[in-house]
């Protein structure tokens, strides 16, 4: 019992919270809150905006973010795509990981011209040690922050 | 190996499923089945609506919730919002773990009648010992109930 | 800690990813890829489109698809249902274990015929060796295939 | 248990405006039930005319549209068809009946009133 | 609109007969379809809803099935209380729209 409660301990395990700084615009990844709240690092290590690997192994990794608009303007994407992606210095780009592609908009009624919608992603991927996952909205615009239990990023070994 | 079968058989689990007493309109958390078909408890108690833990560490909690209507009527709430709450004794507040806001109603075509919706919540919280989960979902009238395989509500320690 | 890393060497897992042979279109499950590019299995077996446990226990099953189109054709179904489904000696049929009915057409917009929408499944079951699991969608001919990154279907004990 | 009542005109003169009113009692029409408009031309099959939520919200047959207002008012607990232009092939009994809820699944007319019948002749 | 085709319209078959009525969607309306019965100079009763689910109080001898676009309907042992004309309705899209119609007699 004493091996199985420090198995749980040592467990490597990650729950990223969304914060107003998360969207930058800039075109990289979606950054996170890693200690206020309900955020938290065990066993894994932050790194702009991407959760590194400090153990070899098979990882459930998952994300939602939170979608929302007006109306449906013509200059907005019709479609989101949200992604998890894998930094590995074994390749020069990205690797996706786990994809959807949403038309989120269309969920605009003739009753109510603000629309909600949710991207729930999650899967086993390995990572090696130093390897990095992290997390890409396009268009980010459309991502809806409030108090980190909207939008979030973590993992957990299995 | 010994070992290692004792831990999975000890590791604090549950999945519980929607019933037809799961809606109370009462303004309270859904109710759910805990023994009969799928559902099930190990290591975890139940109590009016919430899974309690009886060990303390991060449990991966989740939730569906199947949504469905017919026609998006003005009266009608245009926003669905379903969570994960955590009681405390430490707060008198119920505090939100993971949330979504949709706009199922959106689902409805110009023609079509009959809409469907789903919402999965999934993500890593930290439980002590008492502490309770529950799931709520805002206007619960939306929500679809069946045979327990189409809303549902679960945990597992990480 | 040697204990712990072999426990979680060896402890079920899996994530098999789509391909452009998963969809038959002879009403059977969707078949997977189980070794190239993100696929894997770990302790678990797979056969004819189905995980298969080799190890009695509880699992957190997972699928999630990307569905897809353009417009709302009138001989399309306007639900799609998305499902894990059991495949066990003790029963001649498969038994529903978890499920998604969706209206994915409704999100085409007045400003983009083509829609996209994702549906994400996952939770706990119990299996027993030799107990399969399988994913159905009713209608197939919207899922959309690309790379594995968008319908995929996996396991790990728990 | 809920119970419908059509009320209105039995003759409607060619041209003119057709007004029907379905009274509902034993239950709310602020529920999350769609409340229908149906007809039957004599010796003929069924017709969809239309259906309104209590919050004003209306869907009408395309056939009928142009010529078809659907009302609620709350306050009577009742609802209302008025047809206007109408001819001689507009002559049916008119039925008002419940759909399934805007909360539900499944849409079946399951409470009707007996019908009222309605001519169109000069 | 979607075209809701009913046959046979009419039938007369012997009491404890199975009767059988079917109704083709011209378009994939899932389950989304209703049965109902009139009687002579009464408004319609809803039968069965969903295709398949028989509405509380009707008569177990009443049994519908189908999906997709082809749908039956079925009286396992003809009673002489179930004359009257039965009709299928769908509510996959709108308008809501329903079959001509099959009148069942007794033989």
């Known amino acids: 019992l004493i091996q199985e409660r420090r198995s749980h301990q040592n467990n490597p395990a990650a729950h990223l919270t969304g914060a107003n700084s998360s969207l930058t615009g800039s075109g990289g990844p979606l950054l996170w809150e890693t200690q206020l709240g309900l955020a938290f690092l065990r066993g894994l290590d932050y790194h702009d905006g991407a959760l590194v690997a400090n153990k070899a192994g098979y990882y459930y990794i998952y994300s939602k973010v939170q979608l929302g608009g007006v109306g449906c303007p013509l200059g907005l994407a019709s479609t989101i795509t949200h992604g998890l992606y894998k930094r590995t210095p074994r390749y020069p780009e990205e690797l996706e990981l786990l994809v959807s592609q949403q038309s989120p908009c269309g969920r605009a009624t003739s009753n109510s011209r603000v629309w909600w919608d949710s991207s729930f992603l999650g899967g086993v991927v390995h990572l090696e040690v130093g390897e990095e996952v992290v997390v890409r909205v396009l268009d980010e615009r459309l991502v809806r922050l409030r108090d980190g239990t909207r939008s979030y990023f973590g993992a957990f070994m299995v | 190996l010994i070992q290692e079968r004792r831990s999975h058989q000890n590791n604090p689990a549950a999945h519980l499923t929607g019933a037809n007493s799961s809606l109370t309109g009462s303004g309270g958390p859904l109710l759910w089945e805990t023994q009969l078909g799928l559902a099930f408890l190990r290591g975890l108690d139940y109590h009016d609506g919430a899974l309690v833990a009886n060990k303390a560490g991060y449990y991966y909690i989740y939730s569906k919730v199947q949504l469905g209507g017919v026609g998006c009527p003005l009266g009608l709430a245009s926003t669905i919002t379903h969570g994960l709450y955590k009681r405390t004794p430490r707060y008198p507040e119920e505090l939100e773990l993971l949330v979504s806001q949709q706009s199922p109603c959106g689902r409805a075509t110009s023609n079509s009648r009959v809409w469907w919706d789903s919402s999965f919540l999934g993500g890593v919280v930290h439980l002590e010992v008492g502490e309770e989960v529950v799931v709520r979902v805002l206007d619960e009238r939306l929500v679809r109930l069946r045979d327990g395989t189409r809303s549902y509500f679960g945990a597992f320690m990480v | 800690l040697i204990q712990e890393r072999r426990s979680h060497q060896n402890n079920p897992a899996a994530h098999l990813t789509g391909a452009n042979s998963s969809l038959t279109g002879s009403g059977g499950p969707l078949l997977w890829e189980t070794q190239l590019g993100l696929a894997f299995l770990r302790g678990l077996d797979y056969h004819d489109g189905a995980l298969v446990a080799n190890k009695a226990g509880y699992y957190y099953i997972y699928s999630k698809v990307q569905l897809g189109g353009v417009g709302c054709p009138l001989g399309l179904a306007s639900t799609i249902t998305h499902g894990l489904y059991k495949r066990t000696p003790r029963y001649p049929e498969e038994l529903e274990l978890l499920v998604s009915q969706q209206s994915p057409c409704g999100r085409a917009t007045s400003n983009s015929r083509v829609w996209w929408d994702s549906s994400f499944l996952g939770g706990v079951v119990h299996l027993e060796v030799g107990e399969e699991v399988v994913v159905r969608v009713l209608d197939e001919r919207l899922v959309r295939l690309r790379d594995g990154t968008r319908s995929y279907f996996g396991a790990f004990m728990v | 248990q809920v119970q419908l009542q059509e009320s209105g005109p039995g003759l409607v003169k060619p041209s003119g405006t057709l007004s029907l009113t379905c009274a509902v009692s034993?239950?709310?029409?602020?529920?999350?039930?769609?409340w229908n408009w149906v007809r039957q031309p004599p010796g003929k099959g069924l017709e969809w005319i239309g259906e309104?939520?209590?919050?004003?919200?209306?869907n009408c047959n395309p056939s009928l549209k142009s010529r078809v207002t659907i009302s609620v008012d709350k306050s009577k607990n009742q609802f209302s068809l008025k047809m206007n232009s109408v001819t001689a092939a507009d002559t049916a009994v008119y039925y008002c009946t419940r759909g399934g809820a805007a909360a539900g699944t499944n849409y079946g007319l399951d409470v009707w009133g007996q019908g009222t019948t309605v001519t169109v002749s000069s | 609109d979607i075209q809701m085709t009913q046959s046979p319209s009419s039938l007369s078959a012997s009491v404890g007969d199975r009767v059988s009525i079917t109704c083709q969607a011209s378009q994939d309306i899932s389950n989304y379809l209703n049965w109902y019965q009139q009687k002579p100079g009464k408004a319609p009763k809803l039968l069965i809803y969903?295709?398949?689910n028989l509405e509380t109080g009707v008569p177990s001898r009443f049994s519908g099935s189908g999906s997709g676009t082809d749908f039956t309907f079925t009286i396992s042992s003809l009673q002489p209380e179930d004359i009257a004309t039965y009709y299928c309705?769908?509510?996959?899209?709108?308008?809501?729209?329903f079959g001509g119609g099959t009148k069942v007699e007794i033989k």
């Open positions: 034993g239950g709310s029409i602020s529920s999350t039930h769609w």
């Open positions: 309104i939520y209590h919050s004003g919200s209306t």
């Open positions: 969903d295709a398949s």
């Open positions: 309705q769908q509510y996959d899209n709108l308008p809501l729209t």
